[in-house]
């Protein structure tokens, strides 16, 4: 049987050692001990009582069915308590009374039906973050479960098997920062919802079946309700229930985000808010995201037009990789506060992006990132872009482009540019000259010879220069990240001539170890200040006796450099 | 440059399976559609179905629900079509398209000729 | 299914004069302001090579005598001055709704 390995601060390892009961020889000097992935099954009451002194035990996926009830006694100091993903059929409060110290507790994935017979936590005074429940059999909560537990920054319940739900159960934590409820159905949605309004801040609601959700009025009295983020993770719905889950709006009048992430639409994008009040009531939400939504019938999906008036005030928007192909003109029109829109890993062709970005068009859009859709001309791409009048950041990474012509035409305001994993082996003229940052890494450039006035940041790298770009093209550049290109060597004088140049990444090229480089990187310890990857970074390529040396520690041979 | 290069002529006894493959170059694979077109001889364009490498998301022409499986391989940047319970009727040129913007086929490969025949 | 209709079936033109292939769904091809309709040419034992999508936009490497033009359900291409190398088959496709589906084809010839 293999054994522990444990480093000088106390921390030891020993996950998938083929363990079949706690290791003897554990001591105080321990400050965290990780048993994960082993074949435990038992833990008795002096396994683990000279562990006076540790903080943290992980014993996650160890087939432990039986713990003693003292077993933890001497665990005063303990902060992190994993035991996710064991045989524990019963939860025992004994278990938990030393854990005075508490602040992370998973009991996620064991067997057990019920939290147990008693509250487990009441002493549990400094728990921060709890997970708990299962797949298959955890079905009820009860109002004794959450007893003794006031405030909590993450709360976790998988409860995907859920039969009962008592009334109240949620309401005595006064305080959750983050709850994540994963919920097959949602039949006791409602219930929860007005348990949890007057404590959570931000409420993730994950695999959740919200085909059938119906609306009906909350149990609550007037509540100002902290919750500012509301997530949506596997979930599906339909038009119908979309219209229901946003009566749920008016009793989170705080909220700010909301974001959709790999949830399925089974509708067409037909919503119609029934009570016109829900537009006021998302009035604060200023961020709506959605990532990978799956709509089977994408083509047949509606303008949306029923809830433009919902939009109005949105100030960020991301719609990422979910096959987003044409957002109509009357769509971003309606969209007058918007600041950032995302539309990452679209389908988006700058032929089809011209009705989008349409006149009068997101007037407000500061930020659009289109990395990559299918977008194929850059010069299309600018001069469709034009209707933007306050656009100043543009990403449009990932696209594979022609061939760069000389003259574009791009919005008045814009400064960031980001043509990074394009494809382009030129850059010419058709970058405009107002950019303050320029980012052209990944790509296929073997010279950069473009005079850019006003750039402050270049990164330029996972490319194929050979020198570091001349500086007189850039009299105020800041930062330039020139990683993995072919650059063999920098001098003062090249340095130098950069006059108000801060930070320089320029590791994994290909340096040439000449008496020069060398001389210069001895003679200079400032380049620490202004080369952030130094030194480690900076390797010899050449000469052969040099190579794979740091230049830092390499030295030129008196020979060849005095010849 | 972009190349969706097919797999050569099948010729198959009715009743068995057939599996073309197209293979992608010169562009990230998971970013575009694949879509399947089918030419009966001397005859117009049917359009099969599509699948996307991102996700394995697909979508058929009911009139091939049962004829074709849609399946792809992002490591080796290849997708597939599996045609099951061949007759006369299946002899056709099939062809793999890159689907781009989500409404056109803009790189074609060259077409698999399919005889089914005893 | 949204049904194409292309006609003539064939037509015959003189090298250097305009060709016009209409093409008429069963259905409006519009998607809030875009007109889902492609032309595709096709050459004897070729794949079929996209010419237009959206209606009237020329795909890139298209010689400039071929364009699209119309909206809602009745379409043409167009090929002005026609060349020898266009005496081929023509189709158009739409993909406003699935299943996608092409026109019959038209076979230019000359006259």
């Known amino acids: 049987q293999e054994s522990l390995s444990c480093d000088a601060s106390g921390v030891c390892d020993g996950r998938s050692r083929s363990f079949t009961s706690i290791p003897s020889g554990l001591t105080a000097a321990m400050k965290s001990l990780d048993l994960s992935f082993n074949k435990i099954t038992y833990i008795g009451h002096g396994d683990l009582r000279a562990c006076a002194n540790l903080q943290v035990l992980i014993l996650k996926s160890s087939r432990i069915n039986t713990i003693e009830g003292d077993a933890f006694y001497s665990l005063g100091s303990l902060e992190h308590l994993d035991l996710s993903d064991n045989h524990l059929s019963s939860l025992s409060s004994s278990w938990f009374g030393p854990l005075s110290s508490l602040k992370y507790l998973n009991l996620m994935g064991n067997p057990y039906q019920t939290l147990g017979v008693t509250s487990l936590f009441p002493n549990l005074t400094n728990l921060q973050t709890l997970r708990i429940g299962n797949v298959e059999t955890f079905s009820e909560i009860r109002r004794i479960d959450f007893a003794g537990l006031t405030s909590l920054n993450e709360l976790e319940i998988k409860a995907l098997s859920l039969r009962n739900y008592q009334s109240q159960s949620l309401k005595s934590i006064r305080d959750i920062h983050h709850l994540t409820l994963h919920l097959s159905e949602s039949a006791f949605l409602l219930e929860i919802f007005a348990d949890i309004l007057s404590s959570v801040r931000y409420l993730e609601l994950r695999d959740t079946n919200l085909a059938r959700f119906q609306f009906s009025p909350l149990p609550v009295d007037e509540v100002s309700s902290p919750m500012k983020k509301l997530a949506f993770r596997g979930s599906v719905l339909t038009d119908e229930s979309f219209n229901e889950l946003l009566k749920l709006l008016r009793y989170i009048l705080e909220l700010s985000e909301v974001e959709f992430d790999d949830c399925t639409l089974n509708g067409l994008g037909d919503f119609n808010p029934s009570e016109s009040d829900v537009v006021s009531e998302l009035g604060k939400v200023e961020t709506v995201t959605i990532r990978r939504l799956h709509i089977p019938q994408f083509y047949l999906f509606y303008d949306l037009s029923t809830v433009y008036s919902l939009l109005e005030k949105v100030k960020r928007i991301t719609v990422e990789n979910s096959k987003v192909f044409l957002v109509p003109c009357s769509f971003s029109q309606h969209l007058k506060s918007l600041e950032f829109l995302d539309l990452s890993e679209n389908l988006m062709v700058e032929e089809y992006l011209k009705n989008s970005a349409c006149k009068g068009a997101w007037p407000s859009l500061q930020t659009l990132v289109l990395s990559q859709n299918h977008l194929r001309s850059m010069q299309k791409t600018g001069e469709i872009l034009l209707t933007l009048k306050n656009l100043t950041s543009l990403d449009i990474s990932r696209n594979t482009f022609h061939p760069m012509p000389d003259s574009c035409q791009w919005p008045e305001k814009m400064r960031f540019l980001n043509l990074s994993s394009t494809g382009i082996r030129v850059v010419k003229t058709c970058i405009p000259q107002t950019l303050e940052v320029l980012d052209v890494s990944n790509n296929n450039l073997d010279s950069f010879s473009l005079f850019l006035p006003r750039l402050q940041e270049l990164y330029i790298s996972r490319n194929k220069l050979k020198t570091l770009p001349d500086a007189s093209l850039f009299p105020v550049l800041l930062v330039m990240k020139i990683r993995e290109n072919a650059v063999s060597t920098f001098s003062k004088d090249q340095l130098g001539s950069f006059p108000k140049l801060e930070t320089l990444e320029a590791g994994d090229n290909h340096f040439v170890c000449s008496c020069e480089l060398l001389s210069f990187t001895m003679e200079t310890p400032a380049l620490a200040q202004i080369l952030v990857d130094w030194p480690d970074s900076y390797l010899c390529d050449s000469p052969p006796r040099l190579h794979g040396h740091r230049l830092q520690d390499a030295r030129p041979s008196v020979l060849e450099c005095h010849q | 440059q972009v190349q969706l290069q097919q797999s050569g002529p099948e010729l198959v006894n009715p009743g068995a399976s057939v599996k073309l493959s197209c293979k992608a170059s010169?562009?990230?694979?998971?970013?575009?559609?694949i879509n399947w077109v089918k030419q009966g001889p001397g005859q117009g364009l049917e359009w099969i179905g599509w699948?996307?490498?991102?996700?394995?998301?697909?979508n058929f022409n009911e009139n091939f629900k049962d004829k074709a499986a849609l399946t792809v391989d992002t490591s080796s940047s290849t997708a597939y079509m599996e045609l099951h319970s061949l007759t006369s009727e299946d002899s056709a040129v099939y062809f793999c398209?890159?689907?781009?913007?989500?409404?056109?086929?803009?790189?074609w490969g060259q077409g698999t000729t399919l005889t089914v025949s005893s | 299914d949204i049904v194409l209709t292309q006609s003539p079936a064939s037509l015959a033109v003189s090298l250097g004069q305009r060709a016009t292939i209409s093409c008429r769904a069963s259905?409006?091809?519009?998607?809030?302001?875009?007109?889902?309709m492609q032309w595709y040419q096709q050459k004897p034992g070729q794949p079929p090579k996209l010419l237009i999508f959206g209606a009237s936009n020329v795909e890139s490497g298209v010689p400039v005598r071929f364009s699209g033009s119309g909206s809602g359900t009745d379409f043409s291409l167009n090929i002005h001055p026609v060349e020898e190398d266009d005496i081929v088959m023509y189709f158009c496709?739409?993909?406003?709704?699935?299943?996608?589906?092409f026109g019959g084809g038209t076979k230019l010839e000359i006259k």
């Open positions: 699948i996307y490498p991102r996700d394995g998301s697909t």
């Open positions: 010169g562009f990230t694979f998971t970013t575009y559609g």
């Open positions: 496709q739409q993909s406003r709704k699935l299943p996608w589906t």
């Open positions: 259905e409006s091809v519009e998607y809030y302001g875009t007109s889902l």
């Open positions: 398209a890159r689907l781009t913007g989500g409404t056109f086929l803009d790189y």
